[in-house]
């Protein structure tokens, strides 16, 4: 069993632990050339690579955000775009220029007293992609830079489920914790008979969504105990 494998520390049979690191994962584990290691490195020069392709906001400059260049464009083709100034439309904090944040779809000044309290609970590392985001400079570390993110999207590292967006929970993945989708009706779920009775879960599933519970799938009642399949079912 996985439990006995883990207890014996026989690492060769373990499921993935990325990273990485990576990792990823991780998982994985490392940084991009010339980013982790500042100094005369070719890869630090970005002037020659415009428009700069990106996967997330952290890869762009402080006055930029990462998005598809065309409205409704292919999400897989994204570049660094100029940040939105005050009173411009936005969908997340990173779209607004330094000194502003996204409130009700509009970039507003962050110089208001209530700014920190309003969005403190949404602070999370919502990188969305499993890779390093080193820029060679500090980002989102002060109110004037874009420190505040919306709630963690799927794949974002989290500490608790409240860090994750609606429909996601914080669950173990490899040796880390990330936001994963809450299970829907019919999806396989994990049923723990007693707390502490199960082995280490390297890849933890979320719980079943609202109105659902994790029960033995009806056509699996005859199966042996060890192979009974649990799925999310209506109460």
């Amino acid at each position: 069993t996985l439990n006995s494998v883990l207890n014996s520390n026989a690492i060769k049979n373990l499921p993935p632990p990325l990273g990485g690191a990576a990792g990823h994962p991780g998982s994985a584990v490392s940084a991009a050339p010339g980013i982790l290691y500042p100094g005369g490195n070719k890869y630090q020069t970005i002037d020659n690579y415009q428009p700069y392709p990106c996967a997330e906001d952290e890869e762009c400059g402080t006055d930029e955000y990462c998005a598809s260049p065309t409205r409704g464009g292919d999400a897989g083709v994204q570049i660094c775009l100029a940040c939105r100034k005050r009173r411009k439309r936005c969908m997340r904090h990173a779209m607004c220029c330094p000194g502003n944040y996204c409130k009700n779809g509009i970039c507003v000044s962050s110089d208001q007293n209530n700014f920190r309290g309003e969005i403190e609970e949404t602070i999370t590392e919502s990188f969305g992609n499993d890779h390093s985001t080193l820029d060679g400079y500090s980002r989102r570390t002060t109110l004037s830079s874009k420190m505040y993110h919306s709630k963690g999207q799927e794949g974002s590292v989290c500490l608790r489920s409240s860090d994750c967006a609606t429909g996601l929970c914080c669950a173990r993945h490899f040796w880390s914790k990330i936001c994963k989708p809450v299970l829907k009706e019919g999806q396989v779920c994990t049923k723990h008979r007693r707390k502490g009775s199960h082995g280490l879960e390297i890849f933890q599933r979320c719980y079943c969504g609202e109105g659902l519970s994790c029960r033995i799938q009806k056509d699996h009642h005859q199966a042996s105990n060890s192979s009974r399949l649990h799925t999310c079912q209506r109460h």
Partner: antibody, heavy 114, light 112 residues
Framework: QVQLVESGGGVVQPGRSLRLSCAAS????????MHWVRQAPGKGLEWVAV????????YYADSVKGRFTISRDNAKNTLYLQMNSLRAEDTAVYYC???????WGQGTLVTVSS | DIVMTQTPLSLSVTPGQPASISCKSG???????????LYWYLQKPGQPPQFLIY???NRFSRVPDRFSGSGSGTDFTLRISRVEAEDVGIYYC?????????FGQGTQVEIK
Amino acid sequence: QVQLVESGGGVVQPGRSLRLSCAASGFTFSGYGMHWVRQAPGKGLEWVAVISYDGNDKYYADSVKGRFTISRDNAKNTLYLQMNSLRAEDTAVYYCARELRVLWGQGTLVTVSS
Amino acid sequence: DIVMTQTPLSLSVTPGQPASISCKSGQSLLHSDGKTYLYWYLQKPGQPPQFLIYEVSNRFSRVPDRFSGSGSGTDFTLRISRVEAEDVGIYYCMQSIQLPWTFGQGTQVEIK
């Protein structure tokens, strides 16, 4: 700045101990599994150990099992590697590494020599 | 352990010309989460690894687009469309889907 900075390396005699540290900054350290990887002079990389985000689960390469201990202090954003009963073959640059969103430090050199 | 096998072990390239490195893994690196945990990195003498590619084909930020990765399952390729002098060093592939993480033997790239 998102980074990992190792320290604690140096020259040590065989059989002695050394503790490496890895200071993390710029990211949610307590959410990530962390690893140690090493590279002997002129050789490739070798995975050493991993610790889960909460420090409860740890696994080691056979070559260091029983001699090395990986630990972490999430309050201090620091990863550790306690190395006991050091051998000449443990001589290497030791890197701490973050999983999932791959990130490595710049390494710290450990030399085991009499 | 998952064995990672790189070919060729050495490569001499004329500046401006393309280069290609192959990496084969002893078992599939495709995870049930849909991701394939294969990385490429470059190491220069006395320097830490500089990661180029994550999950087979995604470039790390600030990596020039002349670097590209492809492949699936157990067969992977790193391509440099036009080699430049700064690209010299040893290129490694790495898997992180299973402990222990394992690495290719490395491919030394030099300029003719």
